[in-house]
Interface confidence: low
């Protein structure tokens, strides 16, 4: 079951998944000046069985220099509003992705891929938030959000994270980034 909405937006914060649940789809997108290879895959999909999960299909980009148009991402996040665009970045939590059954690791970069990735998340997916550079966490609550199914509809839980400029007074001066608190673990994926 795909999540209908994007993970919540937190001012001055970005989110990242440590691993992706089976069923997750990643659009194959190329940076400006490049395009998917002819007959190349449109998506990568996290698939698997009880013992192993992996990304099916591979994204490949080739130069579009011979064409007079430049590839636009599919979908355009500001035009199709289907799924959140996440910047490629290193993991923020020391989670051993291989230890999560039914999940795929972060797909390795492909040559000339776009600088942002658009994922289509499924129910049960958890994402972690971190304040962007120049901001710090003001709140100790769970800095994570999970997509849950409730009464037949999907929703993302609200992460308890406030990011404030470093020049402002912080009530937790030593805290540089949010911690995923034990009490903030997700409840059952289907609760009613």
């Amino acid at each position: 079951e795909l999540c209908d909405d994007d993970p919540p937006e937190i001012p001055h914060a970005t989110f990242k998944a440590m691993a992706y649940k089976e069923g997750t789809m990643l659009n194959c997108e190329c940076k400006r000046g490049f395009r998917r290879i002819k007959s190349g895959s449109l998506y990568m999909l996290c698939t698997g069985n009880s013992s192993h999960s992996s990304w099916d299909n591979q994204c490949q980009c080739t130069s579009s220099a011979t064409r007079n148009t430049t590839k636009q991402v599919t979908p355009q996040p500001e035009e199709q509003k289907e799924r959140k665009t996440t910047e490629m970045q290193s993991p923020m939590q020391p989670v051993d992705q291989a230890s999560l059954p039914g999940h795929c690791r972060e797909p390795p970069p492909w040559e000339n891929e776009a600088t942002e990735r658009i994922y289509h998340f499924v129910v049960g997916q958890m994402v972690y938030y971190q304040c962007v550079q120049g901001y710090r966490a003001l709140h100790r609550g769970p800095a994570e959000s999970v997509c849950k199914m409730t009464h037949g509809k999907t929703r993302w839980t609200q992460p308890q994270l406030i990011c404030t400029g470093e020049m402002e007074t912080s009530q937790f001066p030593g805290e540089e980034k949010p911690q995923a608190s034990p009490e903030g673990r997700p409840e059952s994926e289907t609760s009613c």
Epitope: E1, L45, N57, P75
Partner: antibody, heavy 118, light 111 residues
Framework: QVQLVQSGAEVKKPGESLKISCKGS????????IGWVRQMPGKGLEWMGI????????RYSPSFQGQVTISADKSISTAYLQWSSLKASDTAMYYC???????????WGRGTMVTVSS | QSALTQPASVSASPGQSITISCTGT?????????VSWYQQLSGKPPKLILY???KRPSGISDRFSGSKSGNTASLTISGLQADDEADYYC??????????FGGGTQLTVLG
């Protein structure tokens, strides 16, 4: 509103060429794929191929590869389906459809009826 | 690339429920959740009624539901109404980045 407007019905003779069109409006037409679907008289739907008007990236069903050409002109938000040499067996209704969210075709044109007869 | 297999026809009386099956392979229906269903009324273009196996676009009645097990997807219509009489087609995204439709099922609502 979001819609796909297809060109009118065509009556052709075998061996003739033809190009039918599908114009998208009400949305950013360069950002969505457009597919073509054939429906022969009294038969089911057959997926022919798909094009991304933003750069004319095209995919074909193996059954239609080499039989038709799918193209697009993004400046006028229009996708095309063309034949260089029609056959009587090309007689069918041809639909264009927008690939929306989740790999499903959410908006359909009304169809273009192509009749090929000597 | 073979068409997905659907029963040619089904029929039932108003108020009853019917289920239409759609059987493919591990390269299409069995591979992903990207199975959709379309309703085609006589003389009209197809209309999307389910996507991602079981999700309904806005405006589609909750009498339409879907499921999938292995290489077979199913469409269930409950509380049949006369205006449900139409042809129904399943479709699936495939591992070769193409789409494939089912052969179609003609639903007759008995008078």
């Amino acid at each position: 509103q979001v819609q796909l407007v297809q060109s009118g019905a065509e009556v052709k003779k075998p061996g003739e060429s033809l190009k039918i069109s599908c114009k998208g409006s009400g949305y950013s037409s360069t950002s969505y794929w457009i597919g073509w679907v054939r429906q022969m008289p009294g038969k089911g739907l057959e997926w022919m191929g798909i094009i991304y008007p933003g750069d004319s990236d095209t995919r074909y069903s193996p059954s239609f590869q080499g039989q038709v050409t799918i193209s697009a002109d993004k400046s006028i938000s229009t996708a095309y389906l063309q034949w260089s040499s029609l056959k009587a067996s090309d007689t069918a209704m041809y639909y264009c459809a927008r690939l929306g969210s989740y790999a499903a075709f959410d908006i359909w044109g009304r169809g273009t009826m192509v009749t090929v007869s000597s | 690339q073979s068409a997905l297999t659907q029963p040619a026809s089904v029929s039932a009386s108003p108020g009853q429920s019917i289920t239409i099956s759609c059987t493919g392979t591990s390269s299409d229906v069995g591979a992903y959740i990207y199975v959709s269903w379309y309703q085609q009324l006589s003389g009209k273009p197809p209309k999307l009624i389910l996507y991602d196996v079981s999700k309904r676009p806005s405006g589609i009645s909750d009498r339409f539901s879907g499921s999938k097990s292995g290489n077979t997807a199913s469409l269930t219509i409950s509380g049949l109404q006369a205006d449900d009489e139409a042809d129904y087609y399943c479709s699936s995204y495939t591992r070769s980045s193409t789409w494939v439709f089912g052969g179609g099922t003609q639903l007759t609502v008995l008078g």
